[in-house]
Interface confidence: low
């Protein structure tokens, strides 16, 4: 969630005399933004999956989309503005650095970082968020994107329980996955997702989507996508919208079959997949038997597993 | 040679549940890829695709008749039964059973169909 | 869900006679299109998968084409035992759906 984006002014300076009384105000002014920040967050939180379902459900209805689009956003726009303008206030008072804030990798491009790789975003306070290592893609599509999930090597199982998925597991420049509470933060602020997908034969494709939201743990990390583009054939996604995240511990599925452990990963599982993008890695010779494997329905169908997948997303006002 | 043969009561009454029976020859349902799908069809009308389940037991439904059905099957016993609930007259129809071969969700061998009539 | 037209609901022809049967699909559906085969009081036979690929045994006059959103099956030249219902099915994504139907009848 991009919460400041404008430029934080300089620290006014302190007149010696009254220097304590105002830092004392200054502490108590900060402590009250902190806490209605806070309450404006788990507000926020509670309210911002209703208003994605709102939105993705006016994409659809073409008459009637642009009104309701228009005030689901300005809804959610109002709510962010108000977190803005707190975190604004309280960021003068306590900080310089805010305005050098970084939340993703897009904020990395803005700031001219424009090599693909490993980044440390810092903790953010506000949010509550630690310090992550993440993998930016500052090329393809114009760049700013943060990577999500790799298969590429086959070294890191992906048959893992909720915690894992949780918290995120893998080695960050191989085969990974960042997290979901790590995906769901990302994703608080309008963001997009691209799926890119290469076979054993050396073909490439993407889908991409205008929409994504990844839910909070009590909503178990439901996966929220809007319009499709792309060129790999079908929209192997979408049989997924909507959809709570299941692992071989927790089924959240929609099927009488615990479609997590049928499939061997953890996913967006409905009964069972059109895509299994965290499957098992099959290499070359094994890579067309299985169902269980990394698989885009309608590409090469439901028993090819892919040779190398990449999730990544960006907000979606980004501007190269 | 490949066969497929529904089997079922033809008369239902209303709000009763009907189970139908697909007993195959030819072709094994442990083989992976292999499906079988049910799809019914009411007299004069179009075809309706209902249910499909695999060798691997993945299973899939059509999202209105979706709390009405049940797909299992038996792989040793060489049959895939469906239970219907809640049984209506505009349920009247032949019921089909198919065999889907690869993942491309299409039915390229057909039982004969077995006619149902849901009346009181 | 993705509903499929099929167009026109009946047709008459005459034996010898070249005929296309179209269907459109509500959205975007690639190649995964079927064709089927219906006579009267008979279970449906594939004709075409994959919008295009023929099916063992059926005759090479039967042919199918289109990707996207618009389809057509043709027939060459039409033999008396063509005269049937033919209907499209999606392929793309569950729930599967067929078209309406199109009525060959003999002129």
């Known amino acids: 969630q991009k919460l400041s984006k404008h430029k934080t002014p300089a620290q006014p300076q302190l007149k010696a005399a009254n220097c304590c009384e105002e830092v004392k105000e200054l502490k108590a002014q900060v402590a009250n933004l902190s806490s209605l920040l806070s309450e404006l967050n788990k507000k926020q939180e509670r309210d911002w999956v209703s208003v994605v379902m709102q939105v993705m459900e006016l994409e659809s209805n073409s008459k009637r989309m642009e009104s309701r689009l228009t005030d689901a956003e300005s809804k959610y726009s109002e709510m962010n503005n108000q977190i803005d303008i707190m975190q604004l206030q309280a960021a003068q008072t306590v900080t310089q650095t805010s305005a050098d804030a970084i939340y993703d990798c897009s904020s990395l491009y803005q700031k001219n970082y424009r090599i693909s790789g490993v980044y440390k975003l810092p903790p953010d306070d506000f949010l509550g968020s630690p310090e992550l290592e993440v993998f930016c893609d500052m090329e393809t599509s114009g760049g700013g994107w943060t990577i999500i999930q790799r298969r590429k090597s086959g070294l890191v199982s992906f048959y893992r329980d909720w915690k894992q998925y949780k918290q995120g597991f893998g080695s960050i420049r191989g085969d990974f996955w960042l997290g979901n509470e790590h995906i769901h933060r990302l994703s608080r602020q309008p963001t997009r997702l691209r799926v890119e997908m290469e076979d054993w034969e050396g073909n490439l494709r993407y889908a991409e989507y205008s929409h994504f939201v990844l839910g909070n743990e009590l909503n178990s990390y439901r996966l929220f996508l809007g319009n499709y583009t792309g060129n790999v054939g079908n929209d192997a996604l979408q049989y997924h919208n909507n959809t709570a995240f299941s692992t071989k511990d927790k089924d959240n599925d929609n099927c009488l079959d615990k479609c997590a452990q049928l499939r061997k990963g953890g996913y967006w599982y409905n009964c069972c997949t059109d895509s299994n993008l965290n499957g098992v890695y099959y290499r070359l010779g094994e890579h067309n038997k299985h169902l269980d494997g990394i698989t885009w329905y309608g590409w090469h169908g439901s028993t090819y597993s892919l040779k190398r997948v990449e999730m990544k997303i960006r907000p979606e006002d980004f501007k190269p | 040679q490949i066969t497929l043969k529904e089997s079922g009561p033809t008369l239902v009454k209303p709000t009763q549940t009907l189970t139908l029976t697909c007993t195959f020859s030819g072709f094994s349902l442990s083989t992976s890829g292999v499906g079988v799908g049910w799809i019914r069809q009411p007299p004069g009308k179009a075809l309706e695709w209902l249910a499909l389940?695999?060798?691997?037991?993945?299973?899939r439904y059509s999202p209105s008749l979706k709390s009405r059905l049940t797909i299992t099957k038996d792989t040793s016993k060489n049959l895939v039964v469906l239970t219907m609930t809640n049984m209506d007259p505009v349920d009247t129809a032949t019921y089909y059973c198919?065999?889907?071969?690869?993942?491309?969700?299409?039915?390229?061998?057909w039982g004969r169909g077995t006619p149902v009539t849901v009346s009181s | 869900d993705i509903q499929m037209t099929q167009s026109p609901s009946s047709l008459s022809a005459s034996v010898g006679d070249r005929v296309t049967i179209t269907c459109r699909a509500s959205q975007g559906i690639s190649s995964y299109l079927a064709w089927y085969q219906q006579k009267p009081g008979k279970a449906p036979k594939l004709l075409i998968y994959?919008?295009?690929s023929l099916q063992s045994g059926v005759p090479s006059r039967f042919s199918g084409s289109g990707s996207g959103t618009d389809f057509t099956l043709t027939i060459s030249s039409l033999q008396p035992e063509d005269f049937a219902t033919y209907y499209c099915q999606q392929s793309f994504s569950t729930p599967l759906t067929f078209g309406g139907g199109t009525k060959l009848e003999i002129k």
């Open positions: 994959a919008a295009s």
């Open positions: 389940i695999y060798w691997n037991d993945d299973k």
């Open positions: 198919a065999r889907d071969y690869g993942d491309y969700w299409f039915f390229d061998l």
